[in-house]
């Protein structure tokens, strides 16, 4: 686990002609905020695809009003970092989308209006624990300057935040098979191993040796469904292992609901729907007035000024029952994707995903990479039913086991010479050409076809392609 951090340094007009109009005006003051979306691997997915690694939204920046006649300056920015926590390993290669949003603060009906001002995207390699990386991206006439890094949250360490460090138990050395944790030499690696036999489907651990159960499962290894332990199922006592399958009396037999309440069976017991003026598990409580506060979950009580007159609860959205005591079955809308099991926990919906899927709504397909490893620091990228390895620089092949020659494909255009380099390749361009791949002709007057050469690079200089 760890955190990706993004620091926005400036957002304003880029160099060159055609400065953009200020997004705010005296009539329509506005303020900026930013959204970052991260995806693992070097995916070129649509902007709308899920932010599988996470997303974050900045605070709103200061209110800005354009000064009439003045050019658009760098716009005032929100304070602080954008932080995207990630629960699992840091993938090393990632795609990002950074959006600049404008919040207009005029007198709109229905509150402020939001509009997307600029969107930049890129693909990068980044090791967790490294220094801040600086970047400049252009979107139309706008320019965004920012820095980013990924850092591990203790006890995780390493370039992927997959190694765990614990304080040493003995002062001199780590246990068998465990190495010291660089740079924390006074700590030792601790592999995260759940308790032996812990159910991989229904159990998980956050500390080595533990086995914590997902909702609906119990037992030391999370292998026992909750319903079989107490067996209040509609159909009588449990057979040895398969749950409540033996036919028996239903829980509504003989109608346990008093005072005219109607009984309905539930998976584990029964439920009474009570007439007005009565509540309780079996509609046994009566003589209630609004002064007794009979409406639950924020329901509004009307009438019922004395015990002889019935009260009515007007329930807020999402609740029902004569006392607003029942939550509407939100799972019936089937929000979980890919066959996930929906659980309504009251404060939130949870999806228990089938093997091979993950995410809050089981929207991420992990199947293609399950049990497959990419060698030499490669990252597995799923898609289309077949796994693919995004290989570290210098390696190639299906599983990144082959040494790659970055110059083999002759990437340098117009007679440029290619040199293999530890971080990729370098093109030394022939006279008259420039660019990372020597793809841009230099015009006779010295201007290039590029919108702007990167700072510090002259036409004809070797350029490293990252």
């Amino acid at each position: 686990a760890g955190v990706f951090e993004l620091q926005i340094h400036s957002f304003g007009p880029g160099p060159g002609p055609g400065a953009p109009r200020s997004p705010c005006s005296a009539r329509l003051p506005c303020r900026l905020f930013f959204r970052v979306c991260l995806k693992p691997g070097l995916s070129e997915e649509a902007a709308e695809s899920p932010c599988a690694l996470g997303a974050a939204l900045s605070a709103r920046g200061p209110v800005y009003t354009e000064q009439p006649g003045a050019p658009a300056p760098d716009l005032p920015l929100p304070d602080g970092l954008l932080q995207v926590p990630f629960r699992d390993a840091w993938p090393g290669t990632f795609s990002f989308i950074i959006e600049t949003w404008r919040e207009e603060l005029g007198d709109q009906i229905g509150g402020p209006a939001w509009s997307l001002l600029a969107r930049v995207a890129g693909r990068r390699r980044l090791a967790a624990g490294g220094p801040w990386a600086r970047d400049i991206q252009r979107a139309g006439a706008w320019e965004l300057r920012f820095s980013y890094r990924a850092r591990c949250e203790p006890p995780a360490v390493g370039t992927a935040c997959t190694r765990l460090c614990r304080p040493r138990s003995a002062p001199s050395r780590c246990g068998p098979g465990l190495r010291p944790c660089a740079p924390l030499e006074d700590e030792c690696e601790a592999p995260l191993v759940c308790r032996a036999g812990c159910s991989p489907e229904h159990g998980f651990c956050e500390q080595p040796g533990e086995c914590r159960c997902l909702e609906g499962w119990t037992g030391p290894l999370c292998t026992v469904p909750v319903s079989t332990s107490s067996c209040l199922s509609p159909r009588g006592p449990s057979s040895a292992t398969t749950g409540c399958l033996v036919p028996g009396p239903g829980p509504c037999d003989g109608n346990p609901c008093a005072n005219g309440g109607s009984c309905s069976e539930t998976p584990r017991s029964f439920e009474c729907t009570c007439p007005r003026g009565f509540y309780g598990l079996r509609c046994e409580v009566s003589g209630v007035t609004c002064a007794d506060g009979p409406c639950f979950n924020g329901g509004l009580c009307v009438g019922g000024a004395d015990p002889d007159s019935a009260y009515i609860c007007h329930c807020p959205p999402g609740f029902q029952g004569s006392n607003c005591e029942k939550r509407v079955d939100r799972c019936s809308l089937q929000p979980c994707r890919n066959g996930g099991l929906c659980l309504d926990l009251g404060h939130a919906l949870r999806c228990r995903c089938r093997a091979g899927f993950a995410g809050p709504r089981c929207e991420h397909d992990l199947d293609d990479c399950a049990g497959r490893a990419c060698a030499n620091g490669g990252t597995c990228v799923e898609g289309g039913g077949a796994h693919r390895c995004s290989c570290a620089l210098g390696f190639g092949g299906r599983d990144c086991r082959e040494r790659a020659d970055p110059c083999a494909a002759r990437p340098c255009a117009h007679g440029g010479r290619c040199y293999a380099h530890f971080s990729g390749l370098v093109c030394a361009c022939a006279p008259g050409y420039m660019g990372a791949r020597c793809e841009f002709p230099v015009h006779p007057d010295g201007a290039s076809a590029l919108p702007a050469a990167p700072p510090g690079l002259r036409p004809g200089d070797p350029q490293r392609y990252l």
């Epitope: 974050a56 939204l57 939100r330 809308l333 089937q334 929000p335 979980c336 994707r337 809050p360 709504r361």
Partner: nanobody, 120 residues
Framework: EVQLVESGGGEVQPGGSLRLSCAAS????????MGWYRQAPGKQRELVAG???????IYAESVKGRFTISRDNAKNTVYLQMSSLRAEDTAVYYC??????????????WGQGTLVTVKP
């Protein structure tokens, strides 16, 4: 904050038609699932029709063949075309949506409801 605003309710005779609309607005990144529930007096709220998280359409048995759900993704709006209406369709119809916010969290939202009355 996210708002769901329903419209199109009213009184209609048996066999008549109505079209309900529900527009979602606010700080929405994407809509995962969206649909219509209804609650008749003294009854539990039940799902009428919806688009699931997997974008399938689902209908309650009692409305199949009579009601049609559709949507306009660009407007974050869902519609319920109700025809061959019966007295038992009388209820408050609520729009519901499972929404992904910009924070990447999902939240479930309800509209305030629109009343549909079917009577001769």
């Amino acid at each position: 904050e996210v708002q769901l605003v329903e419209s199109g309710g009213g009184e209609v005779q048996p066999g008549g038609s109505l079209r309900l609309s529900c527009a979602a607005s606010g700080f929405i990144f994407s809509i995962n699932a969206m649909g219509w529930y209804r609650q008749a007096p003294g009854k539990q709220r039940e799902l009428v029709a919806g688009f699931t998280g997997d974008t399938n359409t689902i209908y309650a048995e009692s409305v199949k063949g009579r009601f049609t759900i559709s949507r306009d993704n660009a407007k974050n709006t869902v519609y319920l075309q109700m025809s061959s209406l019966r007295a038992e369709d009388t209820a408050v119809y609520y729009c519901a949506a499972d929404v992904q916010l910009f924070s990447r969290d999902y939240e479930f939202y309800w509209g305030q409801g629109t009343l549909v009355t079917v009577k001769p």
